[in-house]
């Protein structure tokens, strides 16, 4: 019946428009690591799929950092002459954006995002937590921001900047952050310390969003909420990187955190799901 | 109790196509709580993952890119079964092949293999 | 591909004492919220494998708990507090952080 006939459509990755990086690594994000030199190293950034500069803080990091900018595209451009940010009205979408929604063989109910290019709009998916595809935002806005077409018919990527129509440069936009602070975390970093049902007494940390720190509180061992760590460190980690901080009005955001080892993995791979 | 029994051929000769079936009982192959792999075995290559399908919204499936070219495994929902299928085989392909269930729900990991099949490619 | 690499190949054991299993991923499998996408397997003599550990340190159902995983970033440890002669076999870790799905090369642990 038609019932079977639809069952056994399978959605292959064989069909999908490949994304062309080299090396997996060149998907990650730049990453300083934990030390304060200040050293100058190249990165590939998969959204303006360029290399570019970036400090680098002489320790720990990721594969994604080339001493010279040669090397940066000799391991994660195909054609060096390609330039990624073309001479045209539109900017082209990351290859990824085509890529049809893919829930992952784990089954954790994360909300997230991802571009229909049926629509052409960024939808609502439940992700499983594991693997999928890069077609994954977090948010509704950074899915927009990095596939929908603009109302110009230019791209709006992820770091606040537009392609300029006129002459393809990239010009910072407005934020528009409505308060001197705002949160871009995981949105459980929001809710308060629930300590569940259970009779138990453990020791665990919560992110207080009022205060913007990680504080300590008594988990009963079962229920409870995802604001919730078994360390203060992974709390921080988890939470305090997404209190963003204004420059100024209209100018661009920087996150406010101290200069330490924050993970980098490939954007669509920062995921939370509790132990169940 | 899931089990998996697979079950074809032993010996195949080059250049033809490897054909394995794995028989899913205390699961369902359309389940949304597992997904369905091909993994093999031999002394040169260790275990090696092949591929997997698993059903969601619909179905998915993902395969290795050293047999992507050469690979299918597909859901028979009314025998509730899954199949591999290998193109073009060669003498590299001779391995112990394994179905596994990969478990969606809480333990995250292959927690049902079948009992193997010995694949030998030889005219 | 993310590259498993176990050590060592080889574990001679005696019963009763503990064994540890050293499992290094050329990427990183740990989130930052905590996730370890890693899990260890044992396949005895004759038998398939089976799954003993998953998302780095939970215990599968079934398998006794002087079973233990442990590890972060890209260093994974299984321990065996006491071995026993059933314990016998090759272990494998796998990662399932990225496709493709890679296993490591295996341990292989014998009694003494």
């Known amino acids: 019946d038609s019932e079977e006939d639809e069952e056994h459509t399978i959605i292959t990755d064989t069909e999908l428009p490949p994304l062309k990086l080299m090396h997996s690594f060149c998907a990650f994000k730049a990453d300083d690591g934990p030390c304060k030199a200040i050293m100058k190293r190249f990165f590939f950034n998969i959204f303006t799929r360029q290399c570019e500069e970036f400090i680098y803080g002489g320790c720990e990091g990721n594969q994604n950092r080339f001493e010279s900018l040669e090397e940066c595209k000799k391991m994660c451009t195909r054609d060096n002459a390609n330039r990624i940010i073309k001479t045209t009205l539109q900017q082209e979408k990351p290859d990824f954006c085509f890529l049809e929604e893919d829930p992952g063989i784990c089954r954790g109910y994360i909300t997230r995002y991802f571009y229909n290019n049926q629509t052409k709009q960024c939808e609502r998916f439940k992700y499983g937590g594991c693997l999928g595809n890069m077609n994954n935002f977090e948010t509704l806005e950074e899915c927009k921001n990095i596939c929908e077409d603009g109302p110009n018919g230019f791209q709006v990527d992820n770091y606040g900047t537009q392609l300029n129509a006129v002459n393809n440069s990239l010009t910072p936009q407005s934020t528009k952050v409505p308060s001197l602070f705002e949160f871009h975390g995981p949105s459980w970093c929001l809710t308060p310390a629930d300590r569940g049902l259970c009779r138990a007494n453990e020791n665990r940390f919560y992110y207080n969003s009022v205060i913007g720190k990680c504080r300590p509180f008594k988990y009963s061992g079962c229920g409870g909420n995802e604001n919730n760590f078994t360390s203060k460190q992974e709390c921080l980690r988890a939470c305090k990187k997404g209190f963003i901080q204004r420059i100024s009005k209209g100018g661009l955001i920087k996150t406010k955190r101290k200069r330490k080892k924050q993970r980098v993995k490939i954007a669509y791979e920062e995921i939370f799901v509790k132990n169940m | 109790q899931v089990q998996l029994q697979q079950s074809g051929p032993g010996l195949v000769k080059p250049s033809q196509t490897l054909s394995l079936t794995c028989a899913i009982s205390g699961d369902s192959v359309s389940s949304n709580s597992a997904a369905w792999s091909w993994i093999r075995q031999s002394p040169g290559r260790g275990l090696e993952w092949l591929g997997i399908i698993y059903k969601r919204s619909k179905w998915y499936n993902r395969y290795a890119v050293s047999v992507k070219s050469r690979i299918t495994i597909n859901p028979d929902t009314s025998k509730n079964q899954f199949s591999l299928q290998l193109n073009s085989v060669t003498p590299e392909d001779t391995a112990v092949y394994y179905c596994?269930?990969?478990?969606?729900?809480?333990?995250?990991?292959?927690?049902?293999w079948g009992q193997g099949t010995l694949v030998t490619v030889s005219s | 591909d993310i590259v498993m690499t176990q050590s060592p190949l080889s574990l001679p054991v005696t019963p009763g004492e503990p064994a540890s299993i050293s499992c290094r991923s050329s990427?990183?499998?740990?989130?930052?919220?905590?996730?370890?996408?890693l899990n260890w397997y044992l396949q005895k003599p004759g038998q398939s494998p089976q799954l003993l550990i998953y998302?780095?340190?939970n215990r599968a159902s079934g398998v006794p708990d002087r079973f233990s995983g442990s590890g972060s970033g890209t260093d994974f440890t299984l321990k065996i507090s006491r071995v026993e002669a059933e314990d016998v076999g090759v272990y494998y870790c796998q990662q399932y952080d990225s496709y493709p799905l890679t296993f490591g090369q295996g341990t292989k642990v014998e009694i003494k």
């Open positions: 998302k780095g340190s």
């Open positions: 596994a269930r990969w478990h969606s729900d809480k333990m995250w990991g292959f927690d049902d």
């Open positions: 990427q990183s499998l740990v989130f930052s919220f905590g996730i370890t996408y």
